[in-house]
Interface confidence: medium
């Protein structure tokens, strides 16, 4: 009965084995998660362009319980949140506030999930339901990736490795399942 005291947080549940939806966008900037000091940015180096390798992502660990309808995971899972300023970036003077602000210089680099891991969890349900086994997809590492334009389609490019990604500004969707289908799966009636 240890599940009774669990927090009502959720981590994405893989609908089917082998099917990997993108993590929800709010994972990358969620108030309830661990935050890096100084907004996750690297130390200030005024007017100096840094090499991309010096602006690696921060991998912030956070722990949450998996939920599926009325059920809670027996144990919390630990995941990473990708945070930080990817270079090259410059610290430029802000004329209005006499302060400084960061602006990307050159290609648009993003600190995003790089690798994922699947973890099987046991979900405990209240009373009359048997425990459920579920596989969850968790962020395992982060990487700075570069956004470029190619034939009118945006791609996120790894340094040296090309990986097709959803278009910039568009909410990522599961490959084999529409957002609508996913939502329907989440809406239950009892």
């Amino acid at each position: 009965q240890g599940w009774q005291a669990f927090k009502n947080d959720a981590t994405e549940i893989i609908p089917e084995l082998g099917e990997y939806p993108e993590p929800p966008p709010e994972l990358e900037n969620n108030k309830t998660m661990n935050r890096a000091e100084n907004g996750g940015r690297p130390p200030h180096h005024p007017f100096e362009t840094k090499d991309v390798s010096e602006y690696s992502c921060r991998e912030l660990h956070f722990t949450r319980y998996v939920t599926d309808g009325p059920c809670r995971s027996a144990k919390p899972v630990t995941e990473l949140v990708c945070s930080g300023q990817c270079g090259p970036a410059r610290l430029l003077p802000n004329a209005i506030g006499r302060g400084k602000w960061w602006r990307p210089s050159g290609p648009d680099f993003r600190c995003i999930p790089d690798r994922y891991r699947a973890q099987r969890v046991q979900l405990l349900c209240p009373g009359g339901e048997a425990p459920r086994a579920r596989k969850v997809r968790l962020v395992a590492s982060c990487k700075c990736k570069r956004l470029t334009r190619f034939h009118n389609q945006s791609e996120l490019k790894d340094f040296g490795t090309e990986a097709a990604r959803p278009q910039k500004g568009r909410k990522p969707r599961p490959r084999a399942r529409s957002a609508k289908a996913n939502q329907a799966e989440l809406e239950n009636a009892y």
């Epitope: 927090k7 009359g128 809406e187």
Partner: antibody, heavy 119, light 107 residues
Amino acid sequence: EIQLQQTGPELVKPGASVKISCKASGYSFTDNIMVWVKQSHGKSLEWIGNINPYYGSPSYNLKFKDKATLTVDKSSSTAYMQLNSLTSEDSAVYYCAREGGNYGSLDNWGQGTSVTVSS
Amino acid sequence: DIQMTQTSSSLSASLGDRVTISCRTSQDINNFLNWYQQKPDGTVKFLIHHTSRLKSGVPSRFSGSGSGTDYSLTISHLEPEDIATYYCQHYYNLPWTFGGGTKLELK
């Protein structure tokens, strides 16, 4: 202090819809499931459904599946319940409640919103 | 759905009395039962979780007990502020259901 502030009383015509809100404060809105409960005049409490603000995913009591639509706005820490095709049977006080650290336990309640359906 | 029956819809008692409110379920709910208090102004307060676990801040004169299909809420020494309607609720499975309520009145 944890507070759930609900909108004031509503007087609506049969067949119309109404959307009532529940603004949460004093805790991290996405950390706790929000629950909606109906209390008809002089009667008991009925569980309408739950919504997980983290994902915005609802679970409904089958009885209210076609009657209620639960949504959230994370930016304003507000939960909403829309009631459709209203009839006199829907006249009631509707409560939002926060499921606390213990599963199934509604440890904080709004003050209730009275909905009266009348022509 | 699990039916929750509070046999007494109302109870009369005097201040200082020991009061017991009962709740019966249509099937064994394995202690997955909560108690709530609703004041005459409509304010609802959570009292007891999992049959007998008192919520922090709830006076110790409140206690809960039971198992299987029979549960009860006891107020050991009735105070004026305890005048309210009390509801049991199960969370054994979905849908959660509530008892019909027991209204506590002063003699």
